[in-house]
Interface confidence: low
């Protein structure tokens, strides 16, 4: 079943997805799509990476982490109720039927008068088999591409905590990793 994530109207939604590249420059294509993961590819693609770079995105969908280190978590900016639904993160590992597929359910709630960020209580459930990579932050080499900065001032507590290196280390040490190669 899908892991559920919540955000309020007007906030940014964060959908985590990670893998560990075999080598820093040896990337695996990844696609994000609206709707559950189909047999192949992603339906209704909102963002896609290839072996080198991000080659497609639409304006409210960003990779805020260092995708060159395998952080392909998706941020959706300024969400509306229409953004609710299932999202597919597909790590397109070479070979027949090797892809790793993750369905993440996004629930958008109406904005409160005084917004209070919701806390993700179960970190294990939040990262089913997705934990990994040592990269949380800007690209190490700015001659290589990434994606534009986004408005994270209202992002959820979980997403902010993920940026804390100690938490990232704790999560990394907790086990499951998709390791490519």
């Amino acid at each position: 079943s899908e892991v559920e994530y919540r955000a309020e109207v007007g906030q940014n939604a964060y959908l985590p997805c990670f893998y560990t590249p075999a080598a820093p420059g040896n990337l695996v294509p990844v696609c994000w799509g609206k709707g559950a993961c189909p047999v192949f590819e992603c339906g209704n693609v909102v963002l896609r990476t290839d072996e080198r770079d991000v080659n497609y995105w639409t304006s409210r969908y960003w990779l805020n982490g260092d995708f060159r280190k395998g952080d392909v978590s998706l941020t959706i900016e300024n969400v509306t109720l229409a953004d609710s639904g299932i999202y597919c993160c597909r790590i397109q590992i070479p070979g027949i039927m090797n892809d790793e597929k993750f369905n993440l359910k996004l629930v958008i709630k109406p904005a409160k008068v005084t917004p209070a960020p919701t806390r993700q209580r179960d970190f294990t459930a939040a990262f089913p088999r997705m934990l990994t990579t040592r990269g949380h932050g800007p690209a190490e080499t700015q001659t290589l591409g990434s994606l534009p900065d986004i408005n994270l001032t209202q992002i959820s507590t979980l997403a902010n905590e993920l940026r804390d290196s100690r938490l990232a280390n704790d999560l990394r040490d907790s086990g499951a990793t998709i390791r490519i190669g």
């Epitope: 770079d53 991000v54 080659n55 497609y56 995105w57 639409t58 304006s59 805020n64 949380h136 932050g137 800007p138 690209a139 190490e140 700015q142 001659t143 290589l144 591409g145 990434s146 994606l147 534009p148 900065d149 986004i150 408005n151 994270l152 001032t153 902010n160 940026r163």
Partner: antibody
């Protein structure tokens, strides 16, 4: 080698519209994740980010100036154009054209062009 | 918007001195912090990106550190060409914002 150069009027009158052009070389705005945009600096003051446009035509504006700004690109001419309406003397500043990759720093800058707003 | 506050606003130092400039963000910005050097009449020049990564061609006497809300730019041994104004800038959220600058003057 990446270079950027700003061009446009040096003097505009209050209420007029400012049009600045950034002409660049050494990279293409058709490359994924590349952005070109504008940062200004009033005399003796700090830097202020204005607007950016990315390779996929996504546009980002300063919230405080959004209603006055329009940014466009002409990929074939390697140019980015910024228009700023209803100019005021407080808009007197050096306007810089800058390059960035994705969320990264502003790694290349034009020499800047001083725009004075005065009647 | 995220506010960036630099300190001091100016400082006087001598050639060979170790100089430290601090930058504080109004909220956590992880490592999304860049430093620029600007000389009078010139465009800013990128020195450090991602809090601690040295931009290509920048002398190794420049270094950056910090994460979250507090950041530091250090010049290990000040050289004559280092007298300038230094700005920090966050790229964690839109709009990117700059500090007010720190002017490094000759003592």
């Amino acid at each position: 080698q990446i270079t950027l150069k700003e061009s446009g009027p040096t003097l505009v009158k209050p209420t007029q519209t400012l049009t600045l052009t950034c002409t660049f070389s050494g990279f293409s705005l058709s490359t994924s994740g590349v952005g070109v945009g504008w940062i200004r600096q009033p005399p003796g003051k700090a830097l202020e980010w204005l607007a950016f446009i990315y390779s996929n035509d996504d546009k980002r504006y300063s919230p405080s100036l959004k209603s006055r700004l329009t940014i466009t690109k002409d990929t074939s001419k390697n140019q980015v154009v910024l228009t700023m309406t209803n100019m005021d003397p407080v808009d007197t500043a050096t306007y810089y054209c800058t390059h960035r990759r994705g969320w990264g720093p502003f790694d290349y800058w034009g020499q800047g062009t001083l725009v004075t707003v005065s009647s | 918007d995220i506010q960036m506050t630099q300190s001091p606003s100016s400082l006087s130092a001598s050639v060979g001195d170790r100089v430290t400039i601090t930058c504080r963000a109004s909220q956590s910005i992880s490592s999304y912090l860049n430093w620029y050097q600007q000389k009078p009449g010139k465009a800013p020049k990128l020195l450090i990106y991602a809090a601690s990564s040295l931009q290509s061609g920048v002398p190794s006497r420049f270094s950056g550190s910090g994460s979250g809300t507090d950041f530091t730019l250090t010049i290990s041994s000040l050289q004559p060409e280092d007298f300038a104004t230094y700005y920090c800038q966050q790229s964690y959220s839109t709009p990117p914002t700059f500090g007010q600058g720190t002017k490094v003057e000759i003592k």
